[in-house]
Every structure is written in C-alpha cells, then in structure tokens.
C-alpha cells in the first residue's frame, strides 16, 4: 500500500467574522495508526487547534466521526470566527507511539482569511471653535476590518472633499486593520447647518458604506455684527437707543451697555430669533433720559460672544439745549427688561 499522504485541498479559505470556517483534510491511507492534530502556524511555536486524541476544543467540531478506525476525513469546523483566527492551518498525522506520538506527515496548509467589517466611523472635529474663513481639521477613524483594502471619502453637505490624508495601519500583515483620515475644511458663515461626512467602503459591507458625521454647528463660531441706532423720541425728554446683534452663533452672548465708558447694564441673550442659516439675531434697547445730561453722551454696546474678546459699537447721542425740568433727576420708570434710563 502507498504511504499515507495528508491532503488539504483548499489552499485558502475566506470567512466572514462571526461565521464558521470549514478546514478540509483527508488522508490517503488508514495506516499508520495514530491521531490527527490541527495546528495554526508551523514550527516550534505552532498553536494546537484540535487534537483527535485528547483535550477540549469547544469551538471545533469534526465533519465526520473521527472515533472510527475507517475514517479518512479529518476536516474540522471552527465556529464564531474572529480576525484573530486568521493564519495558516495544518492538518498533521501522527503515528501512535510512547512516550509521545510521533509526527508522521503534514498537509500543505490552508490559509484562513477573515473578512471583518470596519467599525462605524467616528468623526471628531477640533477642540476649539473656529470662525469663517478659517481652515479646520476633522479626523475619521474606523477599526477592526480585514482584508486591508478599504476606501474612505469625505463630504461636506454632499460635496466630495479632496483635501485629506488617509493612513491604514499596520502597514504589514495583520489580523485586522485600522484607518485614520484627516480632512481640512474651510468654514463659511453659512456652515451652522453644515455636516461633514466620512464614508467608508469595504468588501464586507456589500456596497452599503458606513458613514460617520460631524455637525459644523459644534465647530463654527460666527461672530456677530453690531449696529447701534437711535430711535425716534418716545417722550419729550427720552431717547430709545437699540443695539442690533446679528448673525451670531452659538447663542452664548453677553451684552453690556456703557455710558461714556461706564457700565450701565449687562444682560445675557435669551429671547433670540433664528435665521434660516442657523445663526441668531438679538436686540437690546436702552431708554435714555436726555434731560439728565448737559453734554453729549457716548453710548457703547459691548458684546462678548462665546467667551471671545468683546466687540463694541458706539453711538454719540447729541444733547440739544432744552429747559431743565423739575424732577429730572428722578429715574424714569423701567418699561421693559431691555430698557434703561440714564439720568
């Protein structure tokens, strides 16, 4: 009878993570008597996967009944495959012996490759907000995929971006891989409602790419424009001055009125109106009792937005000659939270 050969018919097997891998092995003869063992890898550091004779291998099942003498099919199934299971598996025939069985012949090996899906891409933006016209960086990360080939694209509001750099690690062979990409995005005043999208395509996703998003509302700061105007006289000795704070984002804003450089009132933006582009408008007004002033008054609307250095706009209030009335030093009644009398 011809000498036993160990046949592993599959040079490679590709399995999706979580599925079962079947590793095929047959012998051409029933002699010599002795067990079959399966190993991952070769040489002294090889890892025992299954031993026909003894041991507990909960993930491994045999395709046929290996207890029988007449069996020549030593194929096994390995359940719940993970990327860590990738490698070359050898079916090895031993000859019965003492004190140990003697390795007799090995199969040529079957390379198990594991297809593992990438994790959901995580997009993160800069730690601090930035203003329009500035360029900010976004990063996208996805992990645990195999094989290594992967495609990553960036979009802003559906428009593909071109200014990005991508790395897949590690460079050499590995059981699974990670991708890291950094994209540069120029902010505009209209970006409060904008989204940056990182899209990852991989063979395991069957043409349905994974997406990670970042809202530019978390990144952008649109500084306000200020306009101070004097309204028509409400009463003979009162002037209404308004400060229009327009097109700002985020909402966090504090406004201080100064009269000739002295703090008159400070308030926080509360009842704001939202523009279509996502920015906010707010208005504060001041009721000025001009009869209390002999000289012109410089009114300043000072705004501190989102913890940034204050910006201000001033208005010179002309005090024309007029008779001083009795009780002019008496405070006029406040008619609203945004009103202030100066006397």
């Amino acid at each position: 009878e011809e000498e036993l050969q160990v046949i592993q018919p599959d040079k490679s097997v590709l399995v999706a993570a979580g599925e079962t891998a079947t590793l095929r092995c047959t012998a051409t003869s029933l002699i010599p008597v002795g067990p079959i063992q399966w190993f991952r890898g070769a040489g002294p550091g090889r890892e025992l996967i299954y031993n026909q004779k003894e041991g507990h291998f909960p993930r491994v099942t045999t395709v046929s009944d290996l207890t029988k003498r007449n069996n020549m099919d030593f194929s096994i199934r390995i359940g719940n495959i993970t990327p860590a299971d990738a490698g070359t598996y050898y079916c090895v025939k031993f000859r019965k012996g003492s004190p140990d069985d003697v390795e007799f012949k090995s199969g040529a090996g079957t390379e198990l490759s594991v297809r593992a899906k990438p994790s959901a891409p995580v997009v993160s933006g800069p730690a601090a907000r930035a203003t329009p016209q500035h360029t900010v960086s976004f990063t996208c990360e996805s992990h645990g995929f195999s094989p290594r080939d992967i495609t990553l694209k960036w979009f802003k509001n559906g428009n593909e971006l071109s200014d990005f750099q991508t790395n897949v690690d590690p460079v050499g062979e590995s059981v699974s891989y990670s991708i890291h990409s950094t994209a540069k995005v120029v902010l505009t005043r209209e970006d409060v409602h904008s989204q940056v999208i990182c899209e990852v395509a991989h063979v395991t996703l069957q043409g349905d790419p994974l997406r990670g998003t970042a809202n530019l509302s978390e990144t952008i700061r649109v500084p306000p424009t200020l306009e101070v105007t004097q309204q028509p006289v409400r009463a003979e000795n009162q002037v209404n001055v308004t400060c229009q704070v327009r097109k700002f984002y985020p909402q966090r804003l504090q406004l201080t009125w100064l009269e000739n450089g002295n703090v008159s009132r400070t308030e926080t933006a509360s009842t704001v109106t939202e523009n279509k582009d996502g920015t906010y408008n707010w208005m504060s007004w001041l009721l000025v009792n001009v009869s209390a002033h002999r000289d012109d008054v410089k009114l300043t609307c000072q705004v501190e937005h989102d913890g940034q250095p204050a910006v201000s706009k001033s208005h010179d209030l002309k005090v024309s000659a007029h008779p001083k009335e009795q009780g002019s030093n008496t405070a006029a009644e406040n008619t609203g939270s945004n009103e202030r009398n100066i006397y």
């Epitope: 002699i31 004779k53 207890t67 029988k68 012996g97 004190p99």
Partner: antibody, heavy 118, light 107 residues
Framework: EVQLVESGGGLVQPGGSLRLSCAAS????????MHWVRQTTGKGLEWVSV???????YYAGSVKGRFTISRENAKSSLYLQMNSLRAGDTAVYYC????????????WGQGTMVTVSS | DIQMTQSPSSLSASVGDRVTITCRAS??????LAWFQQKPGKAPKSLIY???SLQSGVPSKFSGSGSGTDFTLTISSLQPEDFATYYC?????????FGQGTKLEIK
C-alpha cells in the same frame, strides 16, 4: 448490526492443527485491523495476533512460528491457522475489531473453544 | 513486552458504592489504555479507550483517567449489573498486553 462470529474450535491432539474462522458483518471489513485474543479457563486475557488493513501481521511470542493470521476481505472473513498445538494453547479464542481510530478493540465475537488434549 | 499490573485482584462493594480500580504499566504507554468488562461465560465488552474515551453506548458512570504508567477506572455508583471482572490493556505497541483482571464482587 455489527457482528463477529467465530467458528472452527474443537478438540485436537497435541501437535495437531486447527483453523479458526471469524465471519464479520455490518461493517466494511477491509477498513479495520482485526485481532485474535484468547482466554484460558479461569485465567486472564492474552492477545494472540493482529492483521492490519494492509495485510501486515504481528504475533505474540508464545505463538510465533506456529500460528498464521490471514484475512479474506471479499468474504469479510478472518482466519487463524494454528499448527503444532500444545496443551497450553487450550483456551476460548475471540476475534476482535480494532474499531477505534487508535486500534482499540470495540467489538468482540462470542468466542470459540479450542481444547488441545490427548 | 510491556507488563500490566492491576490492583486490587478482587474487590467487594455494595450497590451504590463508588469504586476505583488501578492499572500500572511497566513503561510509559502514552495514553493508549483500554478497559474491558467481562461477565462469566461471556465475551469481554469494551468500556473505555485512549484512557478516558467512552465507547459508544457505555454509560457515563464509567470514567477513566491517568497518563504515562498509572491509570484508573472509576465506577461512580455501582448497580447489580456492574459486578464482573475488569481488565485493562495497553495497545501502544505489539504485543498488546492485558492486566490480570480485577474481580468486582457484591458485598
């Protein structure tokens, strides 16, 4: 049903010959090593001989040169030709199948009695 | 030849008892050890192979352990049908050899 049935035992004079047969059924006979084991009255078991799948043979020292094991796969039959019989060969002879992957015996026949006496 | 020595030669026990029979080989036999049960006038019955693997159809009250030269057969809860003679056998190399047997008797 897997079965082994021995036959051919009997009374024989010292120096005589006897041929034992073992008829196998219920399995692919050619795929198994087959053994003969004997048991003397009131004594323990003694392995006698084996014939492998490829026809290779081995014998216990006490029977070497006197006994010959053979098989006929087409008939699913195992044989033991016993020559130059001695009184010490008196025993119940069993055939057994090396049915496990490691050639452990899994199936035994019911036995046939061989008596060597003058 | 490899010598197989069983102990004890005989053992008295009661129904429900747990009993252990030991078998020692004169040299390392890896774990190629089998156990057989034989009742008077009957052929031996295979119980265990490769030290601890149960033959098909053998109840799990029988268990085997050991390696190298020292082996044991344990019957966890004796039933009337378990009173018999038990043999160990090495089959790592020819000639295969048996122990002299342990007769398990009812107390």
């Amino acid at each position: 049903e897997v079965q082994l049935v021995e036959s051919g035992g009997g009374l024989v004079q010292p120096g005589g010959s006897l041929r034992l047969s073992c008829a196998a059924s219920g399995f692919t006979f050619s795929s198994y090593d087959m053994h003969w084991v004997r048991q003397t009255t009131g004594k323990g078991l003694e392995w006698v001989s084996v014939i492998g799948i490829a026809g290779d043979t081995y014998y216990a020292g006490s029977v070497k040169g006197r006994f010959t094991i053979s098989r006929e796969n087409a008939k699913s039959s195992l044989y033991l030709q016993m020559n130059s019989l001695r009184a010490g060969d008196t025993a119940v002879y069993y055939c057994a199948r090396g049915g496990n992957w490691d050639d452990a015996f899994d199936i035994w026949g019911q036995g046939t009695m061989v008596t060597v006496s003058s | 030849d490899i010598q197989m020595t069983q102990s004890p030669s005989s053992l008295s026990a009661s129904v429900g008892d747990r009993v252990t029979i030991t078998c020692r080989a004169s040299q390392d036999i890896n774990n190629y050890l089998a156990w057989f049960q034989q009742k008077p006038g009957k052929a031996p019955k295979s119980l265990i192979y490769t030290t601890s693997s149960l033959q098909s159809g053998v109840p799990s009250k029988f268990s085997g352990s050991g390696s190298g030269t020292d082996f044991t057969l344990t019957i966890s809860s004796l039933q009337p049908e378990d009173f018999a003679t038990y043999y160990c056998q090495q089959y790592v190399s020819y000639p295969y050899t048996f122990g002299q047997g342990t007769k398990l008797e009812i107390k």
